[in-house]
């Protein structure tokens, strides 16, 4: 779970060790603040749960790519 310290800065201290199916993901945001110990991705699932993930992992990068393409593709 992401942890907000002195909001609005949100940091991730641990990453999920489970690969999440892209079908369960709704969006993501990048954590890049130097107030955080590490850069991270926070995925928001379709049930609005937020999960910290390691941006160095291939499945995380692939999921971000998928979501970015999906976001830009107009829904018909």
């Amino acid at each position: 779970q992401p942890d907000a310290i002195n909001a609005p800065v949100t940091c991730c201290y641990n990453f999920t060790n489970r690969k999440i199916s892209v079908q369960r993901l709704a969006s993501y945001r990048r954590i890049t603040s130097s107030k955080c110990p590490k850069e991270a991705v926070i995925f928001k699932t379709i049930v609005a749960k937020e999960i910290c993930a390691d941006p160095k992992q291939k499945w995380v990068q692939d999921s971000m790519d998928h979501l970015d393409k999906q976001t830009q593709t107009p829904k018909t």
Epitope: R30, T32, S34, E39, P55, K56, D68, K69, T71, Q72
Partner: antibody, heavy 117, light 107 residues
Framework: QVQLVQSGAEVKKPGSSVKVSCKAS????????MHWVRQAPGQGLEWMGR????????KFDPKFQGRVTITADTSTSTAYMELSSLRSEDTAVYYC??????????WGQGTTVTVSS | DIQMTQSPSSLSASVGDRVTITCKAF??????RAWYQQKPGKAPKLLIH???SLEHGVPSRFSGSGSGTDYTLTISSLQPEDFATYYC?????????FGGGTKVEIK
């Protein structure tokens, strides 16, 4: 406070090599990627490559492949960039930068490398 | 490589002016672009990354927009400290590439 401090200016002969260092403080380099970007006098920015200090995996612009070596020492939080077979066109300011996503939040102060006979 | 074409290469403006810089990618980069400001003799400074993420400490007069291949940096009311060179960069795929830069000068 994240800081990237680079080694000093270098003057090199054509055909030789140069090695530039970049010491990080305020972050654990194994958590990020360390990149190298150069800028020739009066010119734009050019990405050269990056290293994942955690596993030493590297990625380069094909333009520099075979001529550039990027290494990192996590024990000293230092990244290095070595460029070989120097030519006059390599005269530039060389910057290290950090960022796991491919954009660069923090930059070193730059190291001027002059290649001249 | 994804080529980034930035325009104009230079512009003259006055304090208080609204300034727009454009960047065109040669293929879709899905909002994965960043904007940097660089002053003479200094390292570039990250202003914006991704769709709308303004870096911490960057004034709100800076904004980014666009999608697909076309992106814009807008400075809503130019301040004296904004005279500098601005670069766009794509981070959709390596090798990461920069636009040629836009020098914003005092009119």
């Amino acid at each position: 406070q994240v800081q990237l401090v680079q080694s000093g200016a270098e003057v090199k002969k054509p055909g030789s090599s140069v090695k530039v260092s970049c010491k990080a403080s305020g972050l654990t380099i194994s958590h990020t990627y360390m990149h190298w970007v150069r800028q020739a006098p009066g010119q734009g920015l050019e990405w050269m490559g990056r290293i994942d200090p955690d596993n030493h995996n590297t990625k380069f612009d094909p333009k520099f492949q075979g001529r550039v070596t990027i290494t990192a020492d996590t024990s000293t939080s230092t990244a290095y960039m070595e460029l070989s077979s120097l030519r006059s066109e390599d005269t530039a300011v060389y910057y290290c930068a950090r960022g796991v996503f491919g954009f660069f939040e923090h930059w070193g102060q730059g190291t001027t490398v002059t290649v001249s006979s | 490589d994804i080529q980034m074409t930035q325009s104009p290469s230079s512009l003259s403006a006055s304090v208080g002016d609204r300034v727009t810089i454009t960047c065109k990618a040669f293929e879709d980069i899905y909002n994965r672009r960043a904007w940097y400001q660089q002053k003479p003799g200094k390292a570039p400074k990250l202003l914006i990354h991704g769709a709308t993420s303004l870096e911490h400490g960057v004034p709100s007069r800076f904004s980014g927009s666009g999608s697909g291949t076309d992106y814009t940096l807008t400075i809503s009311s130019l301040q004296p400290e904004d005279f500098a060179t601005y670069y766009c960069q794509q981070f959709w795929s390596a090798p990461y590439t920069f636009g040629g830069g836009t020098k914003v000068e005092i009119k």
